[in-house]
């Protein structure tokens, strides 16, 4: 593991990353749950959507989210004009025309209705911390991840590589 400076190093170029092409390389419909198997659910309340983290009853159907995967070129650290590698960015849409957005000022995760092209706040860098878990890092705020706080989704700052594996930023994707 590479310590705090390493986290800053691998996130600093996110601002400069460019999404290659406007269409996703693939799309994947999945239910989203926390590391502790609580479900992420979406409810329409007063013409806006609320996001909840909750235990579902035994036969209760899980909400699905459409994950759209985009390739993003990552500039080379050395020269600035080369490409060091590729990242996967995702957008998450639980219902037509609504996407998860990072509200960095409020440290919150919100559902916004918007048209394409989507704003940068709707894009999240996809991380695998474990073989069966993913994390979502804000494109607009490197080092900040979607996480669980008080039974809601929130934005959580991760300031060291040890904290990258903290359970509250780990999520499971399931087709069932």
């Amino acid at each position: 593991a590479f310590g705090i400076s390493g986290v800053q190093k691998y996130t600093r170029a996110l601002h400069d990353s460019s999404i290659t092409g406007i269409s996703p390389i693939t799309e994947y419909l999945a239910s989203l749950s926390t590391y502790n198997d609580q479900s992420i659910t979406f409810a329409l309340e007063d013409e806006s959507y609320e996001i909840y983290v909750e235990d579902l009853k035994k036969d209760e159907k899980k909400d699905k989210v459409l994950l759209s995967y985009y390739e993003s070129q990552h500039p080379s650290n050395e020269s600035g004009d080369g490409v060091d590698g590729k990242m996967l960015m995702v957008t998450l849409s639980p219902t037509k025309d609504f996407w998860l957005h990072a509200n960095n000022k409020e440290h919150s995760v919100e559902l916004h209705k918007c048209e394409k092209p989507l704003p940068d706040q709707a894009f999240f860098v996809l991380h695998n911390m474990h073989s069966n878990c993913v994390s979502f890092e804000c494109k607009t705020d490197p080092g900040v991840f979607i996480g669980v706080k008080d039974n809601h989704l929130a934005l959580i700052k991760v300031d060291s590589s040890e904290n990258l594996c903290t359970e509250n930023i780990l999520f499971k994707l399931s087709e069932t």
């Epitope: 390389i25 693939t26 060091d84 590698g85 860098v125 911390m129």
Partner: antibody, heavy 122, light 107 residues
Amino acid sequence: EVQLVESGGGLVQPGGSLRLSCAASGFTFNNYWMTWVRQAPGKGLEWVASITYTGGGTYYPDSVKGRFTISRDDAKSSLYLQMNSLRAEDTAVYYCTRANYYYNTYGGFPYWGQGTLVTVSS
Amino acid sequence: DIQMTQSPSSLSASVGDRVTITCLASEGFSNDLAWYQQKPGKSPKLLIYAASRLQDGVPSRFSGSGSGTDFTLTISSLQPEDFATYFCQQGSKYPLTFGGGTKVEIK
């Protein structure tokens, strides 16, 4: 240019140990999951071990679990495979591979080393 | 574990032929499927990832398709340098698994 260079292969007796190394260059090593894949003579490809980009997680198939250990040294941009209690069926060319994307396992293995041959025989 | 069954295990074809290789998974998964080409004494080379994405530098005569449990690699017009062994690989669930390979030989 991305380069992966394996070393450490050779002839070893059953029950013996061997440590393979993979020297990586041409990319930001600590941003990638790394994986060992092997190929027995005249056979197909078999996944051997994977390690997360942080080094915090390691994964193995049942065939090597408890005998093989994958590790990484980001300061040296190096990947390792410690192989203990070797068996005749571990005889294979061992390849070091790199994931396609930063931080992620998705998208196959675009970069492979030249491979190093491990022969387990008495 | 997800078993990947490739067919045929070998085939003979001529330059210019259209060649199709299939990979059948024992259970459905997201489209994290890759295809590799390997020539004798060489390391495998990634051709296709995400079931249908062409890896940089790979000729456009190679294409991939499929989802769920059925995946296909197609070579639209076989070239002399395409005679090799081809492997599929799923990356969706651990343990990662490869197909048994398809050897494409000259007729």
